[in-house]
Interface confidence: low
C-alpha cells in the first residue's frame, strides 16, 4: 500500500514539532508532541525513550517497563504506587518518569 | 468495564462560557486519545476535536475557536467559549482505538451516553 | 475538508432483505473508515472498523467493504432489532495539519 505525503503506516509513531518560530534563528521555539498511528489494541507509549505504539494491556495493568521504555543498556524500575517509571544508567543517573 | 461518562450539561443563556467533562472507570484517560462529538436534537453526529496524551489538539474546521478541549489526570474536558442556540445539543466524549491515523483503523470504540446542553434565552 | 457522502438517507426494508448503505469520501481514506448504529436516546455503538473488520460482539449479519474512496456497509439478512440510524465516519491524519474526522450524514433504516 502506497503512502502520501505526511501519511503515518499502522503501528508506527512520528514526532511533530509545533510553534516553530524561524524569524528567530537563534531563539528557535519548537514544541515537540507525537503522533502514532496505532493499531486495534496497541496505544501510545515509550519505547527506548522514543513514541511507540504499545500494548493497551501493559497500560491498564501499569507494568510500564514492560513497554522497554529506557535506552537500550538501562535498567528500568518500577515507581512505587506503579506512578511511573525510572531509567538507570551504567553510570547510576537515574531520569524518572511519572505518568499523570 | 470500560466505561465512559459525560457531565455538565445544562440549560445556558447565550454567550455563557460552558465546561463538560467526561470520566472514565475501567480504564486510563491518559494513554488514550479521546474525542468529543456531538448531535443536535433529531440530527446528525459531528465531530467536534480530539486530544493527544500529550495535551496537544485537533479541531473540526468548524469548532476552531468555538471549543476548547483540554485534560487533566481524570477527565477529558470540553469548554463552549462563547455559546449560541446552535451549540444545543447532546454531547458525547468516546475514546479513540489505538489512534486515528491516516486511513488506518479510525474508530471509536467506547462512547459515554452523552450530556444535554440547551442554550436559551 | 474532507466529506462523508452517505446514501440514501432513509430505506425501508422487510425481515430477512439485504441492505446496503454507501459512503463517498471526498479523496481516498485508505480503509479509514467506520460504520456505527445508532438508537433513539442512546450513543452511537460500533459496527465495523478499518472499512471491513466486524467489532467484537457484531452479529456476523453486518459487513463492510470497499476501497479508495468508496465504502458499503451490508446488513446480510436484516432482522427487526437493525432500525436504527447508521453512520459512516471517516478519517484523515497528516502530519502538517492533524486529524480531521468526518461523519456521514446517517441513514435511517426502518424495518417494515
Known amino acids: 500500500q502506497f503512502l502520501k505525503e505526511g501519511q503515518l503506516a499502522a503501528g508506527t509513531c512520528e514526532i511533530v514539532t509545533l510553534d516553530r518560530d524561524s524569524s528567530q534563528p537563534r531563539r528557535t521555539i519548537a514544541r515537540q508532541t507525537a503522533r502514532c498511528a496505532c493499531r486495534k489494541g496497541q496505544i501510545a507509549g515509550t519505547t527506548r525513550n522514543k513514541p511507540s505504539c504499545v500494548d493497551a494491556r501493559i497500560i491498564k495493568t501499569k507494568q510500564w517497563c514492560d513497554m522497554l521504555p529506557c535506552l537500550e543498556g538501562e535498567g528500568c524500575d518500577l515507581l512505587i504506587n506503579r506512578s511511573g517509571w525510572t531509567c538507570t544508567q551504567p553510570g547510576g543517573r537515574i531520569k524518572t518518569t511519572t505518568v499523570s | 468495564q470500560e466505561q465512559l461518562v459525560e457531565s455538565g450539561g445544562r440549560l445556558v443563556t447565550p454567550g455563557t462560557p460552558l465546561t463538560l467533562s467526561c470520566t472514565a472507570s475501567?480504564?486510563?484517560?491518559?494513554?488514550?486519545?479521546m474525542s468529543w462529538v456531538r448531535q443536535a436534537p433529531g440530527k446528525g453526529l459531528e465531530w467536534i476535536g480530539i486530544i493527544y496524551p500529550s495535551g496537544s489538539t485537533d479541531y473540526a474546521s468548524w469548532a476552531k475557536g468555538r471549543f476548547t478541549i483540554s485534560k487533566t489526570s481524570t477527565t477529558v474536558d470540553l469548554k463552549i467559549t462563547t455559546p449560541t442556540t446552535e451549540d444545543t445539543a447532546t454531547y458525547f466524549c468516546?475514546?479513540?482505538?489505538?489512534?486515528?491515523?491516516?486511513?488506518?483503523?479510525?474508530?471509536?470504540?467506547?462512547w459515554g451516553p452523552g450530556t444535554l446542553v440547551t442554550v436559551s434565552l | 475538508e474532507l466529506v462523508m457522502t452517505q446514501t440514501p438517507p432513509s430505506l425501508s426494508a422487510s425481515v430477512g432483505e439485504t441492505v446496503r448503505i454507501r459512503c463517498l469520501a471526498s479523496?481516498?481514506?485508505?480503509?479509514?473508515i467506520s460504520w456505527y448504529q445508532q438508537k433513539p436516546g442512546k450513543p452511537p455503538t460500533l459496527l465495523i472498523y478499518?472499512?471491513?473488520n466486524l467489532e467484537s460482539g457484531v452479529p456476523p449479519r453486518f459487513s463492510g467493504s470497499g476501497s479508495g474512496s468508496d465504502y458499503t456497509l451490508t446488513i446480510g439478512g436484516v432482522q427487526a432489532e437493525d432500525a436504527a440510524t447508521y453512520y459512516c465516519l471517516g478519517g484523515v491524519t497528516y502530519s502538517s495539519t492533524g486529524t480531521h474526522l468526518t461523519f456521514g450524514a446517517g441513514t435511517n433504516v426502518e424495518i417494515k
Open positions: 479523496e481516498d481514506i485508505y480503509s479509514g
Open positions: 468516546a475514546r479513540v482505538a489505538g489512534y486515528v491515523g491516516y486511513g488506518y483503523e479510525t474508530f471509536f470504540d467506547i
Open positions: 478499518g472499512a471491513s
Open positions: 475501567g480504564f486510563f484517560l491518559s494513554g488514550y486519545y
